[in-house]
């Protein structure tokens, strides 16, 4: 008596495809696909493609992630980016002659525009493009804390590289903190790791958009690559929906 | 036409219990339960209970871990501990007057006794018992690298505490490296985090078994709590079995 | 591991990750996702034989636990183990949006 | 989350983690594990209704994806999500051994 069952691969694939159709719409909280009637003709805007590519690169660099996901994490996250306050801003004045660190300031109101409420933020990454370098250096990241104090956030050992490379730091907690405070300018400090007995505390890493050699015609390209915050957040309207359906479970 | 099926909870439980019976034996690579004929009478030895408790505490402190596990990780890991070389050893002489760090040395031959081959090691943790403290301090851990150079391993922000507390650092890679080298004395340095502009670089953290106030009668208790390596490794005989069945997949 | 490296290059009958590329336009009839044009969704398929503690050849049964029922389930099932997210670009009205969808790509499977 | 907090305090019919305490002596007839005497193994049980894209009340169906078929499986299954290890003490001959068994305790379940 055989208990073998032949699996209908085509049926399984069809069911999987149908399930994916529902999955994508449900993750976006859409009852049906959005109409394309208003989509402007022509290719996607440059900035949108850059943002998509940043996100795609992040995915490729991530290990596969089978972690238990809270309900809110099931739903899609909108991705936006907030560029660092331009280097010509007066706020950078007093940081000019410090050799062990570089500074990056952000306008909280720009962040709040992308993420209106702190709980909506699911991830924030500080992205810096490091220029090619022949030296190894241990670097640290700090958050501006009060007038002249800095809070340690993390570190990285940077090995020599022949090509520019993106560095990414998880700063979700910091950005959520900024959103909980009033508007204003907030910042990060990227420093050489100064050990207790080391004498040479100079930062040997050059960061795109911060290093002084800026050629005029490369301005906008350079600008696209200056340090930025990559934000992932639940859109407000999706969050309200989520909040109101909490009673289900 | 109803397609409801009543679930026989008792049958499900029975099947789960049977599966667990097989699971435990298979994780230990035992074809049958070990005979208890030679088990000495009386309670478990103190040292074994201490080791069991260390492991159990580690589990409780860990978040649930649904990560994909490589085949080797399916099987049970034997847990052992290797105590730090005694403080009276001459090796500590030249580290006595350094205020920014404390030093812990280990005998590689003791480690090799517990883990005969580097690939068998699945996890190594450096465990330190920090005494109660009213100050917050940012600390760093380094590995002895060559004669007088140290390699950065990690850091921790230690907040004030009213009770002694165990600190744990994952040092799997380091211990695996030591096992790949010859026998000898290897070590860790536990330091204050010295920032580029900070003046006070003193380590304010007291570690049990290292701090000087050692009262005679508390020697052995103190000894149990001196820094140690908690090692998790596949027993050699189980590993050989695993190796020979590799061809299956 | 029952991952794409092993499963795509073998004829494994038991639980394994299977290839499935979804073309948004062709398979779902959707033109509204502007990037990417499709993605390797994949799926898990194949039996996870339930191993009761049969006394015959018990040691052989035990060796199979790791593959067929590592979680000692009462009825093990072939399910995704490692998953990856998928970023997409689409428009809401005139506004382009970049969103990341979690757990969309199956990289490996397991009996659970 | 379909974890012990939620499932042990509700009468959820669908996929949930169910209570199961294993007493090594009573349930398995084993005296050879010296510590612990038993442990909360738990298990996953309950249907994960497959949600085909039923056109009726589609928006209601979509709201259920997160619960019943978050991975968009062709046949979703109730399986462990978060697992914890179990340390044990036993003797081999006269030698006591402390070993850690991975993924022994089911803390939460999911439809996968």
């Amino acid at each position: 008596l055989s208990t073998c069952k032949t699996i209908d691969m085509e049926l399984v694939k069809r069911k999987r495809i149908e399930a994916i159709r529902g999955q994508i719409l449900s993750k976006l909280r859409l009852a049906s696909p959005p109409s394309q009637g208003e989509v402007p003709p022509g290719p996607l805007p440059e900035a949108v493609l850059a943002l998509y590519n940043s996100t795609r690169d992040r995915v490729a660099g991530e290990s596969a992630d089978p972690e238990p996901e809270p309900e809110a994490d099931y739903y899609a996250k909108e991705v936006t980016r907030v560029l660092m306050v331009d280097r010509n801003n007066a706020i950078y004045e007093k940081t000019k002659d410090i050799s062990h660190s570089i500074y990056m300031f952000f306008n909280t109101s720009d962040i709040r525009e992308a993420v209106p409420e702190p709980p909506l933020l699911s991830r924030a990454e500080l992205r810096l493009q490091r220029l090619k370098s022949s030296v190894e250096q241990h670097v640290e990241l700090y958050q501006k804390y009060s007038n002249n104090s800095w809070r340690y956030l993390g570190n990285r050992l940077l090995t020599p590289t022949d090509t520019p490379e993106w560095l990414s730091f998880d700063v979700t907690g910091v950005v959520r903190q900024w959103l909980n405070q009033g508007d204003g300018i907030q910042g990060f400090r990227f420093s050489a790791h100064c050990s207790c007995d080391s004498k040479d505390n100079k930062l040997h890493v050059e960061i795109n958009g911060i290093s002084p050699k800026r050629r005029g015609d490369l301005g906008t390209i350079h600008d696209m690559n200056r340090p930025f915050l990559l934000l992932m957040a639940t859109p407000l309207e999706r969050a309200q929906h989520l909040h109101s359906s909490r009673h289900r479970r | 036409l109803s397609t409801c099926k009543t679930i026989d909870m008792e049958l499900v439980k029975r099947k789960r219990i049977e599966a667990i019976r097989g699971q435990i034996l298979s994780k230990l690579r035992l074809a049958s339960p070990p005979s208890q004929g030679e088990v000495p009478p009386g309670p478990l030895p103190e040292a074994v209970l201490a080791l069991y408790n260390s492991t159990r505490d580690r589990v409780a402190g860990e978040s649930a871990d649904p990560e994909p596990e490589p085949e080797a990780d399916y099987y049970a890991k034997e847990v052992t501990r290797v105590l730090m070389v005694d403080r009276n050893n001459a090796i500590y002489e030249k580290t006595k007057d350094i205020s920014h760090s404390i030093y812990m040395f280990f005998n590689t031959s003791d480690i090799r006794e517990a883990v005969p081959e580097p690939p068998l090691l699945s996890r190594a943790e450096l465990r330190l018992q920090r005494l109660k403290s009213s100050v917050e301090q940012h600390v760093e851990l380094y590995q002895k690298y060559s004669n007088n150079s140290w390699r950065y391993l990690g850091n921790r922000l230690l907040t004030p505490t009213d009770t002694p507390e165990w600190l744990s650092f994952d040092v799997t890679g380091v211990v695996r490296q030591w096992l790949n080298q010859g026998d000898g004395i290897q070590g860790f340095r536990f330091s204050a985090h010295c920032s580029c502009d900070s003046k006070d670089n003193k380590l304010h953290v007291e570690i049990n078994g290292i701090s000087p106030k050692r009262r005679g009668d508390l020697g052995t208790i103190h000894d149990m709590n001196r820094p140690f390596l908690l090692l998790m490794a596949t027993p050699l005989e189980r590993a050989q079995h695993l190796h020979s069945s590799r061809h299956r997949r | 591991a029952l991952d794409t490296n092993y499963c795509f290059s073998s004829t494994e009958k038991n639980c394994c990750v299977r290839q499935l590329y979804i073309d948004f336009r062709k398979d779902l009839g959707w033109k509204w996702i502007h990037e990417p044009k499709g993605y390797h969704a994949n799926f898990c398929l194949g039996p996870c034989p339930y191993i009761w503690s049969l006394d015959t050849q018990y040691s052989k049964v035990l060796a199979l636990y790791n593959q067929h029922n590592p979680g000692a389930s009462a009825s093990p099932c072939c399910v995704p183990q490692a998953l990856e997210p998928l970023p997409i670009v689409y428009y809401v009205g005139r506004k382009p949006k970049v969103e990341q969808l979690s757990n969309m790509i199956v990289r490996s499977c397991k009996c659970s | 989350a379909l974890d012990t907090n939620y499932c042990f305090s509700s009468t959820e019919k669908n996929c949930c983690v169910r209570q199961l305490y294993i007493d090594f002596r009573k349930d398995l007839g084993w005296k050879w594990i010296h510590e612990p005497k038993g442990y909360h193994a738990n298990f996953c049980l309950g249907p994960c209704p497959y949600i085909w894209s039923l056109d009726t009340q589609y928006s209601k169906v979509l709201a259920l994806y997160n619960q019943h078929n978050p991975g968009a499986s062709a046949s979703p299954c109730c399986v462990p999500q978060a697992l914890e290890p179990l340390p044990i003490v036993y003797y081999v001959g006269r030698k006591p051994k402390v070993e850690q068994l991975s993924n022994m305790i089911v803390r939460s379940c999911k439809c996968s």
């Epitope: 859409l30 394309q36 009637g37 | - | 809401v92 009205g93 | -």
Partner: antibody, heavy 120, light 107 residues
Framework: EVKLVESGGGLVQPGGSLSLSCAAS????????MSWVRQPPGKALEWLGF??????????EYSASVKGRFTISRDNSQSILYLQMNVLRAEDSATYYC???????????WGQGTTLTVSS | DIQMTQTTSSLSASLGDRLTISCRAS??????LNWYQQKPDGTVKLLIY???RLHSGVPSRFSGSGSGTDYSLTISNLEQADIATYFC?????????FGGGTKLEIK
């Protein structure tokens, strides 16, 4: 409960102007596009235009038949939608509906309508 | 502009009947086809969106199907409350356009 109530209809002479209003309740007004649709007596429905939501900057879109003569606006603080109609013609006589528009290309809730008659 | 054509302007049926109303687009509208019901008092309600999705609160005796340029609305087990005019509308390309309507009467 989503509710849309139009008002302001009546009799107007050709060449004249009139403003219609639509009071919305039961939903977050700024999240939605709002639209005007009309139906001449015994004829089909005709889409006139919409005003977009907050994320889309409250910009407007019109059908060719009313572009330049009709203006859609909104008062978000009061949740009111307006249709300002100028240089009215006899063929503008119709029942005017305000409707909530969704990104899916459909109108999910409609008002009861208000009637405009353009006649001398 | 995309033209929407409902060839049957009026339809007569008996209570309990199953009937189908059709709608054709002048070009492929990728399933962005919606159906509305207008009662004799002028009240308009959405019934079905994106070809076959039932709007909340709409009885399941209403269903929709179709693809490309041809679409239909089916009412099974006709009730007195279903007496109305039914309009189709495309949401694929601006400007949104409606069909001429199909008026349903009881025999």
């Amino acid at each position: 409960e989503v509710k849309l109530v139009e008002s302001g209809g009546g009799l107007v002479q050709p060449g004249g102007s009139l403003s219609l209003s639509c009071a919305a309740s039961g939903f977050t007004f700024t999240d939605y596009y709002m639209s005007w649709v009309r139906q001449p007596p015994g004829k089909a429905l005709e889409w006139l235009g919409f005003i977009r939501n907050k994320p889309n900057g409250y910009t407007t879109e019109y059908s060719a038949s009313v572009k330049g003569r009709f203006t859609i606006s909104r008062d978000n603080s009061q949740s009111i939608l307006y249709l300002q109609m100028n240089v009215l013609r006899a063929e503008d006589s119709a029942t005017y509906y305000c409707a909530r528009y969704t990104g899916g290309g459909y109108f999910d809730y409609w008002g009861q309508g208000t009637t405009l008659t353009v006649s001398s | 502009d995309i033209q929407m054509t409902q060839t049957t302007s009026s339809l007569s049926a008996s209570l309990g009947d199953r009937l189908t109303i059709s709608c054709r687009a002048s070009q492929d509208i990728s399933n962005y086809l919606n159906w509305y019901q207008q009662k004799p008092d002028g009240t308009v309600k959405l019934l079905i969106y994106y070809t076959s999705r039932l709007h909340s609160g709409v009885p399941s005796r209403f269903s929709g199907s179709g693809s490309g340029t041809d679409y239909s609305l089916t009412i099974s087990n006709l009730e007195q409350a279903d007496i109305a005019t039914y309009f189709c509308q495309q949401g694929d390309t601006l400007p949104w356009t409606f069909g001429g309507g199909t008026k349903l009467e009881i025999k």
